[in-house]
């Protein structure tokens, strides 16, 4: 029962996760133009992985897609690419889990499939999450570096008299979402890691027992069904793992399809 | 059709606090930000202030203490109350509609305020 | 504040000729998150409300005739009236719509010679 209930809640906390995964990574607000110690314009400015957006004191707001693939910093690209390998490792990881759930029958299902299929799940959330806070962490640390380094423009080359307002730009909703889904999913993988071990049959120790037939001597020693745990060559196993990585291949052209919506 | 139109007294005492209502029609203030404007007699304009969809405001620093500008979104009313008028008040007070650009697209035909006793 | 100086204050040019009006702010209103100046043009005639003619230093309003260009970028900004009509003569205002507070240029008053 409290395998089941491990289970269960490893896989819904992983379904909220890349949920918020795909919230962050489609979300404008990765960074927001900072207002502190600022002039107060009339513009906000605020950009996401895919386009960057202006919204007017009026309330009128105005979003550009970044048009161009190769124009784009490289940090920018390493996050989608973060981003996007966790929502596919996460997505297949929902798929595969959902067929692992115990309170769920599927034909003859063994338990030890089951297993297998759980601790499959439970490393795709756990990478999935690392993917996330990676890519994450990433973007804020070029956030800060990018920040500091226009604080420091703001105060040098101001001899001439005309100012010109340097747009800093500070965390954004997105990061945070990003954070606290990464680490969901985390969770989630981890809870499912565990259910694995309480999913697969502990080897049966019996104690030998001899039966005398007349005339020979032969011991049965029942015992010894040892469950597959996940790491010896489950050919469903290996199907999961190669349709991860065709779908992992065939994802990469996304942000390029994306910025010429 | 676009309409604001302002009213309000045409004569205030010094001291006095101004009072004024911006009526609009063609538009909900839910949609759009209204702006108030003054123009001294033969002078320049001069921006005050402004109310924004969701209720927030922004004022010119330099009239900051004495400004404050409401609406009535049932009502489609934005008013604009000064505090402690004098002479240098005395002006054309303009309601307008912000549009792209924080642009003023639209402007009422204004209402003149005189401050004298 | 934004101070916003326009030259001339007073221009007089003949019908069908060129006018062209200068305003400059003291900050650059160009926003770098959409590379666009944040500067709008009004035409004020005597005994009415101004009128929206540019916005976002270039972009004409819709119903302004094509002879009004707004051009510039940063600080410095330019109105121009092709063929000056006799119903062109009025006050021209230039406004920061960028850094409040959302200040004025003093105005030009244009005439016919």
């Known amino acids: 029962m409290a395998v089941t209930a491990c289970q269960g809640l490893g896989f819904v906390v992983s379904l909220i996760g890349i949920a918020g995964i795909i919230a962050a990574t489609c979300m404008d607000q990765w960074s927001t133009q900072d207002l502190y110690n600022n002039p107060v314009t009339a513009v906000f400015n605020y950009q996401g992985l895919w386009r960057s957006c202006v919204r007017e004191s009026s309330g009128f707001t105005e979003c550009r897609g970044y048009f161009t693939l190769l124009g784009l910093p490289a940090m920018l690209q390493a996050v989608r690419a973060l981003m996007i390998v966790g929502i596919v490792l996460g997505a297949i990881g929902l798929l595969v889990s959902i067929f692992a759930l115990k309170c769920i029958r599927i034909g003859s299902m063994e338990d030890s499939a089951k297993a297998n299929m759980t601790l499959t799940s439970g490393i795709m959330f756990i990478v999935s999450g690392l993917c996330a806070i990676a890519g994450v962490s990433v973007f804020a640390n070029m956030l800060v570096t990018n920040f500091w380094m226009s604080t420091a423009n703001m105060y040098t080359g101001m001899g001439g008299m005309v100012q010109t307002v340097q747009t800093r730009y500070t965390f954004g909703a997105a990061l945070f979402v990003g954070w606290v889904a990464g680490g969901l999913t985390l969770i989630g993988g981890v809870m499912m890691c565990i259910a694995c071990r309480g999913l697969a049959p502990e080897e049966t120790n019996y104690k030998a027992v001899s039966y005398h037939a007349s005339g020979h001597s032969v011991a049965y020693k029942p015992g010894g069904f040892k469950a597959s745990t996940g790491f010896g060559s489950n050919t469903k196993n290996k199907k999961i793992y190669d349709g991860g990585a065709r779908t992992e291949d065939e994802v990469q052209s996304y942000p390029s399809k994306h910025d010429y919506v | 059709q676009v309409q604001l139109k302002e009213s309000g007294p045409g004569l205030v005492k010094p001291s006095e606090t101004l009072s004024l209502t911006c009526t609009v029609s063609g538009f909900s203030l839910t949609s759009y930000a209204i702006s108030w404007v003054r123009q001294p007699p033969g002078k320049g304009l001069e921006w005050l202030g402004e109310i924004w969809t969701g209720g927030g405001t922004n004022y010119n620093s330099a009239l900051k203490s004495r400004v404050s500008i409401s609406k009535d979104n049932s009502k489609s009313q934005v008013f604009l109350k000064l505090s402690s008028v004098q002479a240098a008040d005395t002006a054309r007070y303009y309601c307008?509609?912000?549009?792209?650009?924080?642009?003023?697209?639209?402007w009422g035909q204004g209402t003149l305020v005189t401050v004298s006793s | 504040d934004i101070v916003m100086t326009q030259s001339p204050d007073s221009l007089t040019v003949s019908l069908g000729e060129r006018a062209t009006i200068n305003c400059k702010s003291s900050q650059s209103l160009l926003n770098s998150g959409n590379q666009k100046n944040y500067l709008t043009w009004y035409q004020q005639k005597p005994g009415q409300p101004p009128k929206l003619l540019i916005y976002w230093a270039s972009t004409r309003e819709s119903g302004v005739p094509d002879r009004f260009t707004g051009s510039g970028s940063g600080t410095d900004f330019t109105l121009t009236i092709s063929s000056l009509q006799a119903e062109d003569v009025a006050v021209y205002y230039c406004?920061?719509?960028?850094?409040?507070?959302?200040?004025f240029g003093p105005g030009t008053k244009l005439e016919i010679k």
């Open positions: 406004q920061n719509n960028f850094i409040y507070p959302l200040t």
């Open positions: 307008g509609r912000l549009s792209y650009g924080n642009s003023l697209d639209y």
